[in-house]
Interface confidence: medium
């Protein structure tokens, strides 16, 4: 237990969020970070994973309603599996119906997140900014 | 000290953010909430104050870089003082130079925040969504 050495007292009227990597956004106990540098999907995934996170996974409009207001397009962890035609997240879980509106912007097997819960299909090799996410336990 | 009754252990590799009102966004120990309902500036200010917060104050591009990616227009706490022509925050502090690009969209004495650190002048009576902010100590 040696890693745990700070004690924090929390007022009942408010609450702490996290824990998250330093200077990440914390919302409803999930951690998010928006990265400015443009990378292809694979390098974006590698960047997130090197920070003990994954590319954005959209699992709930309620718990992730902050995503409504995100400007521009950013890689998320959604990929097309050609063999069965489904869209799946990096961890292998299936995209739940009615969570995202999938729009075919380009031919491709990766998807960009855009505001108001839209997913734009894009070629995985195209450089884009990206969103990393870490779910707290 | 009766309000403080939760103890949290924090891993050194990560950190907690806050405290913030429940389900607010926490970033670099500031708390933010985006409100969907459209209100005029005065009602928006009252709404934030009733939650022990104020309308958004932009004080640092570095500490508030999450605001770069905010879509749409939202009331912030910036108001025009006709007597001296300056733009001030609710707390009376002057708008720092080079923080916001002020754009005259309408005749008015209030300002809407828009992505990439822009401020749009608007009539204070016009209904808009708004951003509340609470700075943690």
């Amino acid at each position: 237990n040696s890693l745990f050495n700070q004690e924090v007292q929390i007022p009942l009227t408010e609450s702490y969020c996290g824990p998250c990597p330093k200077n990440w956004i914390c919302y409803k106990n999930n951690c998010y970070q928006f990265f400015d540098e443009s990378k292809n999907w694979y390098e974006s995934q590698a960047s997130c994973m090197s920070q003990n996170a994954s590319l954005l996974k959209v699992y709930s409009k309620e718990d992730q309603d902050l995503l409504k207001l995100v400007k521009s397009y950013h890689w998320m962890g959604l990929v097309h599996i050609p063999t069965n035609g489904s869209w799946q997240w990096e961890d292998g879980s299936i995209l739940s119906p009615n969570l995202l509106t999938i729009i075919e912007m380009q031919k491709g097997d990766c998807a960009l997140y855009a505001s108001s819960f839209k997913g734009y299909i894009e070629n995985c090799s195209t450089p884009n900014t990206y969103i990393c996410m870490q779910r707290t336990v | 000290n009766s309000l403080f009754n939760q103890e949290v252990q924090i891993p050194l590799t990560e950190s907690y953010c806050g405290p913030c009102p429940k389900n607010w966004i926490c970033y670099k120990n500031n708390c933010y909430q985006f409100f969907d309902e459209s209100k005029n500036w005065y009602e928006s200010q009252a709404s934030c104050m009733s939650q022990n917060a104020s309308l958004l104050k932009v004080y640092s591009k570095e500490d508030q870089d999450l605001l770069k990616l905010v879509k749409s227009y939202h009331w912030m706490g910036l108001v025009h003082i006709p007597t001296n022509g300056s733009w001030q925050w609710e707390d009376g502090s002057i708008l720092s130079p080079n923080l916001l690009t002020i754009i005259e969209m309408q005749k008015g004495d209030c300002a809407l925040y828009a992505s990439s650190f822009k401020g749009y002048i608007e009539n204070c009576s016009t209904p808009n969504t708004y951003i509340c902010m609470q700075r943690t100590v």
Epitope: E43, A46, D91, S93, I94 | -
Partner: antibody, heavy 121, light 107 residues
């Protein structure tokens, strides 16, 4: 598409060894190369993975504790696992593996043939 | 770390039998679970990913089910080539972990 492993063999306790895995038939730079080991008559144990692209990002199991190091050579489409401070408990078959799709990192459909590492005095 | 508990550790069955192997995760992993088959002296072979999706080229007698923490691999009619050891593996997050394995032997 295949993964061809090399290296391995007999090493004394405290010694070091390098095991490598050459990829062919696919774009190495878009995949994660993963390493898994299996002690004699035991189950599979994940060691870690390295991204084949420019970032060369790595991820390790907690138990590795700095003793093992992953590296990769983009020009050679090769990933290597450097094993240091070896003990008898590290005696195992070491496998490299590749995910089923470039977009995955944790589901493996292509495996190397395995390389046996024996630690004994 | 997520622990994966597989049962039974071994079982004896005859050709034509229906065989069921279970795997339990120590926390909710949605459907992020894979099943592998391994024969002596060979590398593992992916059978099923995402809990229930059959890998290309794998016979349809293999099926997977489950979500959350409880998962099942079923072989509807055991064939001679199916005698092997089967492993589950979660793909939810790092570090990855495998179940202890289930050895399917001839009765």
């Amino acid at each position: 598409q295949q993964l061809e492993q090399s290296g391995g063999g007999l090493v004394t306790p405290g010694g070091s060894l390098k095991v490598c895995c050459k990829a062919s038939g696919f774009d190495f730079t878009t995949y994660w190369m993963t390493w898994v080991r299996q002690a004699p008559e035991k189950g599979l144990e994940w060691i870690g993975c390295i991204h084949g692209g420019d970032s060369g990002a790595t991820y390790y199991a907690n138990w590795v504790n700095g003793r093992f190091t992953l590296s990769r050579d983009i020009d050679q489409s090769t990933g290597c696992l450097q094993l240091n401070s070896l003990t008898a408990a590290d005696t195992a078959m070491y496998y490299c593996a590749r995910p089923g799709y470039p977009s995955w990192s944790k589901t493996f459909d292509l495996w190397g043939q395995g390389t046996m590492v024996t630690v004994s005095s | 770390d997520i622990q994966m508990t597989q049962s039974p550790s071994s079982l004896s069955a005859s050709v034509g039998d229906r065989v069921t192997i279970t795997c339990q995760a120590s926390q909710d992993i949605s459907n992020a679970l894979n099943w592998y088959q391994q024969k002596p002296g060979k590398a593992p072979k992916l059978l099923i990913y995402a809990a229930s999706t059959l890998q290309s080229g794998v016979p349809s007698r293999f099926s997977g089910s489950g979500s959350g923490t409880d998962f099942t691999l079923t072989i509807s009619s055991l064939q001679p080539e199916d005698f092997a050891t089967y492993y589950c593996q979660h793909s939810n997050s790092f570090p990855l972990t495998f179940g202890g394995g289930t050895k399917v032997e001839i009765k």
